[in-house]
């Protein structure tokens, strides 16, 4: 069975084809090759003789037991080698020779028992080494690591490491500029020798499900003393054994680390007193809780020095009391409990993401809701009912505003966005908005992107609501049940590049409303009911137009519409997916491609 | 279409069939077997995925006695620092995991429940597997 040609001459997918050898019928130019789940079993010298351009090679689950010297020799362009799930028993010292550009080596679940004997010391370009899910017992980083000066990610998770000693990390002292992220999760740790991490700098350290008791956690964290880490991730996994007890003493040792960003990811335990618990983390710049349950929500008004707070997928009794002077970014997403938003006091806040919480807002939005006048980014998407009762007073700095899939009330009663002259991006898609007021977008003089799909208009008519949006480049009006539009609806949009009118109820096409769109490149009218043109004589679309989508409409392929069908043929170079432009009527021509019709007035005779 | 039996409990019988062409082997055990009136137990899964599990989600299509409920999307793996350790599993890596579950107080009417589970993962998104579970529910059976 042949391999699947994904990208001709470049990418070949040969997964699970029962190959016992490397195929010899693929082009020399192949760059990406997936041979996974084939019983190759043995890789001899120069196994990839015929693949000089190879950049990505996937050999997952190929039952490989032996890799000989020079198996990958001359693959000088190879950047990614994946060996996941191979029961390697014999790995020659020169197994990886010739890989002078290798950046990513994945040897997950390959029976690797030690880093010491892993012959990769010459791979100077290596950036990522993943040896998770193996049998490694010692965390001693061999001397050859001093050659791996580009290493950025080392994944040792799911191994058998129990202890870390001072000597294990000696090589890292010789590499002070290393930007290394280290994942040690799911190793059954019970001892970290104090001083082992002294004066070590890491970009990221992840320790999840490493400790089987509170005491072990406490002493191991104390063993991290002296570590300087940009990002520290602690926590557990839902489907692994969890700590029976967790209290403030667990994290006391963090006072002896220098941490820029901290994250606690999943804890099967109720956090009550977070002030005491995170006492050593009051001055990290970024603090993050993922999938934890928080009892006392008042604690977030303590004088923490965080600049970025992230609360994701957490459970709260009610919406937390947030009073944080220095906070610039707040991400509060996909949380449960506390369905009603309550005011926060965050005077330095510039970025606020409150998406996917099912929150309702009694009044939105003004400075008093968020306690800041510095807000530039506000995401309230995928929430409940949001009642627009204020026109963003004090929030004039806003540049990005997203309400998609929330239920907006009172949107058409006044110019809600009047003060947002700096706004660049607005998404009110699927917000149950019914446009009944022409001044709905007044004030948005800087707006470049407007997404309002899935809403509706009074009498299914698009009026002149865009007159002030002179900088608009992207407009999405799909799924709005539109049937007609004002001939001057788009007259002021001379910068518009993309216009999506798909999934509406237009029965005819008219070029007149688009005559002022001098920058228009993409016009999508797919999934309407277009049968014919509005006027007998259709003019040309703007000369800038490059893509016109008229697929899945109801074209009437009859003689009376001959000029329209001819006009469509004349637009051929603009049309996309022409094979999906089919006649709907008359019945004998139903399903025929519009462009293949021979349009003469013999058509219906 | 071969039917794979999972387990029987006092009020339910659970089995599944594949609803995809690939039919890559997956082993599913529930202990103790689910009782629909209330249940607490462990779901054990053994599986070798044909793609990375990063950004795994399920599309669930549930039918109750021929009535179709709206499609439900359940995100399992968001993509970073996920709740489940198997979210970091790579294509070809053995997934051998036990997940605890519990629910109570749901009143199910007697009948046949079908649930098509479409597992989607990776970037670009592709189907990982598709299983159609059938639960025959007899509330008062012993």
């Amino acid at each position: 069975e042949p391999c699947v040609e994904v990208v001709p001459n470049i990418t070949y997918q040969c997964m699970e084809l029962n190959f016992y050898k490397i195929p010899d019928n693929l082009p020399f130019s192949t760059k990406n090759l997936d041979l996974s789940f084939n019983p190759l079993r043995h890789l001899g010298s120069y196994s990839f003789f015929s693949f000089p351009e190879l950049q990505v090679l996937d050999l997952s689950r190929c039952e490989i037991q032996t890799i000989e010297d020079g198996a990958y020799q001359s693959l000088s362009h190879l950047s990614t080698l994946i060996l996941t799930g191979n029961p390697i028993q014999s790995l020659a010292l020169g197994a990886f020779s010739g890989l002078s550009s290798l950046q990513k080596l994945v040897a997950v679940e390959t029976n690797l028992a030690s880093l010491e004997n892993f012959p990769i010391g010459h791979l100077k370009t290596l950036k990522e080494l993943n040896v998770a899910h193996n049998l490694i017992q010692s965390f001693k980083l061999p001397e050859y690591f001093s050659n791996l000066t580009n290493l950025e990610h080392l994944d040792l998770s799911s191994n058998k490491i129990q202890s870390i000693y001072c000597t294990d990390l000696r090589v890292l002292h010789q590499m002070p500029l290393l930007n290394l992220s280290l994942d040690l999760s799911l190793n059954p740790m019970n001892f970290i020798q104090p001083g082992a991490f002294k004066e070590i700098r890491l970009h990221k350290l992840t320790l999840r499900n490493n400790f089987d008791s509170l005491n072990v956690m406490k002493t191991c964290i104390q063993g991290l003393a002296g570590l300087e880490v940009h990002r520290l991730v602690l926590g557990e996994f839902r489907n692994e054994g969890n700590l029976e007890k967790f209290d403030k003493s667990a994290l006391e040792g963090l006072c002896n680390l220098t941490i820029e960003e901290f994250r606690l990811a999943y804890l099967d335990y109720y956090l009550d007193d977070i002030i005491d618990l995170f006492n050593c983390l009051t001055n990290v710049s970024s603090f993050s809780l993922v999938s934890v349950t928080i009892e006392r929500v008042k604690d977030f008004s303590y004088n923490f020095g965080w600049q970025h707070l992230e609360l994701v997928n957490c459970k709260f009794g009610q919406f937390p009391t947030l009073k944080l002077k220095s906070l610039k970014r707040l991400t509060f997403t996909s949380n449960k409990g506390g369905n009603a938003f309550s005011e926060v006091d965050l005077p330095s806040l510039e970025f606020l993401d409150l998406s996917r919480n099912g929150l309702s807002f009694k009044g939105c939005c003004s400075q008093s809701d968020f306690g800041t006048t510095s807000l530039k980014y506000l995401d309230l998407s995928f929430n409940g009912v949001i009642t627009m009762s204020s026109n963003f007073l004090g929030l004039e700095q806003l540049e990005h505003l997203d309400f998609q899939h929330s239920n907006l009330k009172q949107m058409s009663e006044f110019s809600v966005f009047l003060s947002l002259r700096n706004l660049i991006y607005l998404d009110i898609s699927h917000t149950h908005t019914r446009v009944a007021f022409n001044g709905i977008f007044n004030g948005l003089s800087s707006l470049e992107v407007l997404k309002m799909a899935g809403n509706s208009f009074q009498e299914n008519f698009l009026p002149d609501i865009f007159t002030e949006l002179r900088n608009l480049t992207f407009l999405d009006l799909s799924q709005c049940q539109l049937e007609q539009l004002s001939p001057t609806a788009f007259n002021s949009l001379s910068s518009l590049q993309v216009l999506n009118m798909s999934h509406n109820n237009f029965f005819s096409l008219d070029t007149f409303p688009y005559k002022c769109l001098n920058s228009l490149q993409v016009l999508d009218y797919s999934l309407n009911h277009i049968m014919t043109s509005k006027k007998q004589e259709l003019q040309h679309f703007p000369s800038s137009l490059a893509f016109l989508n008229l697929t899945q409409n109801d074209f009437a392929c009859t003689c009376e519409h001959q000029s329209f069908l001819q006009w469509i043929k004349d637009q051929r170079q603009l049309l996309v997916e022409v094979e999906r432009m089919e006649c709907a009527t008359p019945s004998d021509k139903q399903g025929m491609p519009v462009l293949s019709l021979n349009i003469t007035c013999q058509m219906n005779k | 279409q071969k039917q794979y039996w999972v387990c029987n409990s006092s009020d339910a019988s659970i089995s599944y069939t594949y609803c995809d062409k690939m039919q890559y082997p997956i082993s599913i055990n529930v202990n103790p077997c689910i009782e629909l009136k209330r249940s607490k137990g462990l779901l054990h899964i053994f599986y070798i995925p044909r793609r990375d599990l990063k950004q795994l989600y399920f599309n669930l299509y549930i039918t109750v006695n021929t009535m179709n409920l709206p499609k439900r999307k359940e995100v399992i793996c968001r993509g970073s620092d996920d709740d489940y350790s198997f979210c970091r599993a790579l294509k070809g890596e053995t997934v051998n995991t036990t997940i605890s579950f519990s629910f109570k107080g749901i009143k199910f009417s007697k009948g046949k429940y079908k649930c098509v589970v479409e597992a989607i993962s990776g970037s670009p998104e592709e189907m990982l597997f598709c299983l159609e579970f059938v639960i025959l529910h007899q509330p008062n059976s012993n």
Epitope: I22, D24, N25, F28, G44, Y46, S47, F49, S50 | -
Partner: nanobody, 117 residues
């Protein structure tokens, strides 16, 4: 078993030309691809040019494109490498290699090419 014998190497001035030959004998029916590789002192062996026996498709390394030409003579079971516009950086031992359908690779003993004024 396949035997490969190279010839044609030597000393040449920059800008000059050489033609290398590689004669194959033995189980030549099993060969799927043949090619020329080179190895400079202290460097890894690298691809220069490849040719597919079945359909004659060809590959050249970027560094030799437009200067070197690989060809084959099926009747003589020989593969050639015509090297024009030679540069000092082309100095290396040139090896002929043959890959069989079973992914086994055979090598010649190598021929020295030196480009120097």
């Amino acid at each position: 078993e396949v035997q490969l014998v190279e010839s044609g190497g030597g000393l040449v001035q920059p800008g000059g030309s050489l033609r290398l030959s590689c004669a194959a004998s033995g189980s030549i029916f099993s060969i799927s691809d043949m090619g020329w590789f080179r190895q400079a002192p202290g460097k890894e062996r690298e691809h220069v040019a490849l040719i597919r026996i079945k359909d004659g498709s060809i590959y050249y390394a970027d560094s030799v494109k437009g200067r070197f030409t690989i060809s084959r003579d099926n009747a003589e079971n020989t593969v050639y490498l015509q090297m024009n516009s030679l540069r000092p950086e082309d100095t290396a031992v040139y090896y002929c290699g043959a890959k069989t359908g079973t992914s086994f690779v055979y090598w010649g003993q190598g021929t020295q090419v030196t480009v120097s004024s």
